[in-house]
């Protein structure tokens, strides 16, 4: 089941997605698409990165975080009700059957009739944790090549913590944008 994120009409929506680069600047291609993740690639691509840079984007869709450090969270500017739906973040790890796929559900709420002014806040301090990788299986002798490891269990966990925390719920209700360090 998809993790659900909310935004109000007219605001910016934030859909989190992260990975751990093997080394700074050692990037993995990522695509964002509208619709659930298909077998390969992303359907209805709205943004794509390669090993160096963002190489494709469409209006209103951008990466606000430092994608060179693995923060490939998508920001959708000035959302409308039509932006509701499932979005796919796909970390395209080289080799077959390696891609990490996240389906995120965006729910757009109509704007309040008299919206109270809200101040955008940065919640780095509220969530001061690093995404670290955990071992897979038994200890191994291994040579690290130029390839990248992502532990998506932890990313999901962080996303769920954000989603489930009272602070996040309070923020969502107030319409503030949630940002992760």
């Amino acid at each position: 089941s998809e993790v659900e994120y909310r935004a109000e009409v007219g605001q910016n929506a934030y859909l989190p997605c992260f990975y751990t680069p093997a080394a700074p600047g050692n990037l993995v291609p990522v695509c964002w698409g509208k619709g659930a993740c298909p077998v390969f690639e992303c359907g209805n691509v709205v943004l794509r990165t390669d090993e160096r840079d963002v190489n494709y984007w469409t209006s209103r869709y951008w990466l606000n975080g430092d994608f060179r450090k693995g923060d490939v969270s998508l920001t959708i500017e000035n959302v409308t009700l039509a932006d509701s739906g499932i979005y796919c973040c796909r970390i395209q790890i080289p080799g077959i059957m390696n891609d990490e796929k996240f389906n995120l559900k965006l729910v757009i709420k109509p704007a309040k009739v008299t919206p109270a002014p809200t101040r955008q806040r940065d919640f780095t301090a509220a969530f001061p944790r690093m995404l670290t990788t955990r071992g897979h299986g038994p200890a191994e002798t291994q040579t690290l090549g130029s390839l990248p490891d992502i532990n998506l269990t932890q990313i999901s966990t962080l996303a769920n913590e954000l989603r489930d925390s009272r602070l996040a719920n309070d923020l969502r209700d107030s319409g503030a944008t949630i940002r992760i360090g």
């Epitope: 990975y19 790890i93 080289p94 080799g95 390696n98 690290l144 090549g145 490891d149 532990n151």
Partner: antibody, heavy 124, light 105 residues
Amino acid sequence: EVQLQQSGAELARPGASVKLSCKASGYTFTSYWMQWVKQRPGQGLEWIGAIYPGDGDIRYTQNFKGKATLTADKSSSTAYMQLSSLASEDSAVYYCARWEKSTTVVQRNYFDYWGQGTTLTVSS
Amino acid sequence: DVQMIQSPKSMSMSVGERVTLSCKASENVGTFVSWYQQKPDQSPKLLIYGASNRYTGVPDRFTGSGSATDFTLTISSVQAEDLADYHCGQSYSYPTFGSGTKLEM
């Protein structure tokens, strides 16, 4: 301890279908691809396909599309492979194997645990 | 599909000798190559992954090397228990295997 326990030997008639099982234990079944591999007597290994129980993603090699059908039951941590329209060339040992995939930091992509194999004999 | 060609088909060795098994890929597969040992009437077991990484518990007499299209498995001092078939496989694209090399004593 990771274990893959496969169903017992099968004897089938040409044209029939058979369903092989592979029960996984000792790890999170939904977090790893389960692969199926064929080995005919005295021959090499041939990849059939794979299923990712977490989201139901399935891949087949061209040679086994229409021949093999892969499914998984998350509640019992069991993967299944059904082989249809059996012929003598389907006689082989069939293995299930867990796949350790690469991540953004470590290159893996290997079959790390294998079942004991199920021998299928197709004969009239 | 990527073809994996193993040579030789079989080889006869004496205990203590150095053994070199070869595997060639029909196209560049980077270092996405693994080696598996299969003893008679047993399932395959992983020896080497990523072309040169020894898997957990594998004796250090087994060494893998190579990249792109040419790969080698070396057993520095073969033991009686190494009697087995050895399979190379690539996993850059959908997995394919060589036909195996039978090591006989």
